[in-house]
Interface confidence: low
Amino acid sequence: QEEDLPRPSISAEPGTVIPLGSHVTFVCRGPVGVQTFRLERDSRSTYNDTEDVSQASPSESEARFRIDSVREGNAGLYRCIYYKPPKWSEQSDYLELLVKESSGGPDSPDTEPGSSAGPTQRPSDNSHNEHAPASQGLKAEHLY
């Protein structure tokens, strides 16, 4: 019988209220044996995958998604999900990132190019159904 996958957790370092221009790292944690962690933004249609998974403890693996220079548009809801063959987990709870405005900062787009919070390319809208089960159409090679 297949094991039940525990829900992942999500946290942010150094916190969830980040000054404009500072860095933030989202940390997704799950059980050992995770192949892929995914950080989802606002809805399932926007996400980033990583297979750069490390062991946080003997019973826990983690992945880190860093935004080097947080901008106003990075504010929003984030959550994690992971793939441990042959199944995708449930989503974590949402974590809300707040960005503290600073005078004179640019009103900015929603994510840094090259940052970890958004993939470099999107899945095509034709082939990706945001409301489909998480196991559909989500292999990393579909992104790049």
Partner: antibody
């Protein structure tokens, strides 16, 4: 299939008003920012306005040339975006495009076919 | 506000030639630059985003590059379907201004 369909263009006198509409379909509308871009006959593209999603409190942004005259708004329940244009000037004559912003990589990735606005007496 | 200065305004070239279009930003836009192609009577389409990344389905003869605040779009071995107008646009801060455009015509 992602589609953006503009309507509401036409002939209007200087100082008049017009409201453009954009009907979106084929994507989760409420998570995307939408822009209006215009193109005067035989000229280049001009960015006009942007409205972001609920998660950013529907923040709006405008080109200096239309500030205080144009208002962008949206109705997520209907997947619609609007551009209310007041105090129109002859230089506002253009094709107006409704465009989706893709925040993965910041490009205007889906464009409507445009609606033509002519401001003339 | 960031201004985008695009050159040349027009360009005549033959099929098979290589051409380069440039946009200079008046400030640092941190590679938040997109290139579009527009055919006569049609809506624009994305060619390159983040200054250097080719949009899905765009032929590899197109490439984007940057040097400081100068951004370039290079088209190798021009094909008949490449003729039209090209625009850059920055996304660093509002207003998200476009370059003035380059009309690429067949010689």
């Amino acid at each position: 299939e992602v589609q953006l369909v503009e309507s509401g263009g036409g002939l209007v006198q200087p100082k008049g008003s017009l409201k453009l509409s954009c009907a979106a379909s084929g994507f989760t509308f409420n998570t995307y920012a939408i822009h209006w871009v215009r193109q005067a006959p035989g000229k280049g593209l001009e960015w006009v306005a942007r409205i972001r999603s609920k998660s950013t409190n529907y923040a709006t942004y405008y080109a200096d040339s239309v500030k205080d005259r144009f208002t962008i708004s949206r109705d997520d329940s209907q997947s619609m975006v609007f551009l209310q244009m007041n105090n129109l000037k002859t230089e506002d004559t253009a094709m107006y495009y409704c465009v989706r912003e893709n925040w993965y990589y910041y490009a205007l990735d889906y464009w409507g076919q445009g609606t033509s606005v002519t401001v003339s007496s | 506000d960031i201004q985008m200065t695009q050159s040349p305004a027009s360009l005549s070239a033959s099929v098979g030639e290589t051409v380069t279009i440039t946009c200079r930003a008046s400030g640092n836009i941190h590679n938040y630059l997109t290139w579009y192609q527009q055919k006569q009577g049609k809506s624009p389409q994305v060619l390159v985003y983040n200054a250097k990344t080719l949009e899905d389905g765009v032929p590899s003869r197109f490439s984007g590059s940057e040097s400081g605040t100068q951004y370039s779009l290079k088209i190798n071995s021009l094909q008949p379907e490449d003729f039209g107008s090209y625009y850059c646009q920055h996304f660093w801060s509002t207003p998200f201004t476009f370059g003035s455009g380059t009309k690429l015509e067949i010689k």
